[in-house]
């Protein structure tokens, strides 16, 4: 009696089970009575990464640099490529299909964390005594300049944003 | 579809300690961030902590820092807060969020059903 | 921290009608902000993020604006599943802080 299912690794065609191709390989032409199931290899810019009936393989991904994207790891004939995104940029989603800029902190902010190839730039308000003027994905707020250390005396107060003004010690009120 | 189911939630005396877990599924758990968000009885929204994707940074509120811990097990999809020396004011239902992550990250896409704990004498 | 207000506290409107929410920053925070809804007994859900980008599911009757200190929610007809607490969420620095929340009531 001919089988109704087939075991792992196998599948039913004209009342036959016959053997899948193994991850890499593709189907060129299913078992028969007398002839077990015939595989290619995948080519060099092709894949399959299960145990498979497919005719045809499925080609690498490209990590298309126009789109920031480079190649986190080569394909094989069982792997797909494994794009990541270029140095300052993070991917717009899991798939990974093109790449943004790491959030940058506003003047007021600093880094608290940089960016990850799966999370953004996490900013953080700059603190009494700190400041940052520009808007960047990589600076932390810097400290406010001691006027003191190099004997001068604060003119204008410092801000989130702004560093302190030193001047020069009135000399009238020694 | 994206689930996160809490549980740990319960009645505990002041001083005690509590663990909450987070299940998660329907989504690659290992990728994205993961927050824990609270909300007093008839009070509005408090972030509480944030746990980066592989677990490399964590970061609290100054309310709950020194007395909760964060952690993430990706081999089981599941999230952690450890809370230690309960107070009154800890009461709350406490939401175990994702993070958008990506371009969206430190915005919450799903949230848990939450679980309620409850310090109380 | 960033401080988030948001008004009016509780606005009470009839089906069809046009609902405006604001939400104002303590500081300069771009366009990194969330808009959520919350009915009762239920976990909060994201409606808005980025400030105007509508997250995927939710119904074009709502949309989001602004940027820099003040942002709006704005329900364009109101329906009965609207009603519920409607909170904002600055994201762009830690920590993470929301919005007093608004309560919405069908007339």
């Known amino acids: 009696e001919p089988p109704t299912a087939c075991r792992e690794k196998q599948y039913l065609i004209n009342s036959q089970c016959c053997s899948l191709c193994q991850p890499g390989q593709k189907l060129v032409s299913d078992c028969t009575e007398f002839t077990e199931t015939e595989c290619l290899p995948c080519s060099e810019s092709e894949f399959l990464d299960t145990w498979n009936r497919e005719t045809r393989c499925h080609q690498h991904k490209y990590c298309d640099p126009n789109l920031g994207l480079q190649v986190q790891q080569k394909g094989t004939s069982e792997t797909d490529t494994i794009c990541t995104c270029e140095e300052g940029l993070h991917c717009t989603s899991e798939s990974c299909e093109s790449c943004v800029p790491h959030r940058s902190c506003l003047p007021g902010f600093g880094v608290k964390q940089i960016a990850t190839g799966v999370s953004d730039t996490i900013c953080e308000p700059c603190p009494v005594g700190f400041f940052s003027n520009v808007s960047s994905a990589f600076e932390k707020c810097r400290p406010w300049t001691s006027c003191e250390t190099k004997d001068l005396v604060v003119q204008q107060a410092g801000t989130n944003k702004t560093d302190v003004v030193c001047g020069p010690q009135d000399r009238q009120r020694a | 579809q994206v689930q996160l189911v809490e549980s740990g939630g319960g009645v505990v005396q002041p001083g005690r300690s509590l663990r909450l877990s987070c299940a998660a599924s329907?989504?690659?758990?290992?990728?994205?961030?993961m927050h824990w968000v609270r909300q007093a009885p008839g009070k509005g929204l408090e972030w509480v902590a944030l746990?980066?994707?592989?677990?490399?940074?964590?970061y609290y509120a100054d309310s709950v820092k020194g007395r909760f811990t964060i952690s993430r097990d990706n081999s089981k999809n599941t999230l952690y807060l450890q809370m230690n020396s309960l107070r009154a004011e800890d009461t709350a239902v406490y939401y175990c969020?994702?993070?958008?992550?990506?371009?969206?990250?430190?915005?919450?896409?799903?949230w848990g059903q939450g679980t309620l704990v409850t310090v109380s004498s | 921290d960033i401080q988030m207000t948001q008004s009016p506290s509780s606005v009470s409107a009839s089906v069809g009608d046009r609902v405006t929410i604001t939400c104002r920053a303590s500081?300069?925070?771009?366009?990194?902000l969330a808009w959520y809804q919350q009915k009762p007994g239920k976990a909060p859900k994201l409606l808005i993020y980025?400030?105007?980008s509508l997250q995927s599911g939710v119904p074009s009757r709502f949309s989001g604006s602004g940027s820099g200190t003040d942002f709006t929610l704005t329900i364009s007809s109101l329906q009965p599943e609207d009603f519920g607490n409607y909170y904002c969420?600055?994201?762009?620095?830690?920590?993470?802080?929301f919005g007093q929340g608004t309560k919405v009531e069908i007339k």
């Open positions: 969020v994702k993070d958008a992550g990506y371009s969206s990250s430190w915005f919450f896409d799903y």
């Open positions: 329907g989504f690659t758990f290992s990728n994205y961030a």
């Open positions: 746990i980066s994707f592989d677990g490399s940074y964590k």
């Open positions: 500081q300069d925070i771009s366009s990194w």
């Open positions: 980025a400030a105007s």
């Open positions: 969420q600055q994201a762009n620095s830690f920590p993470w802080t």
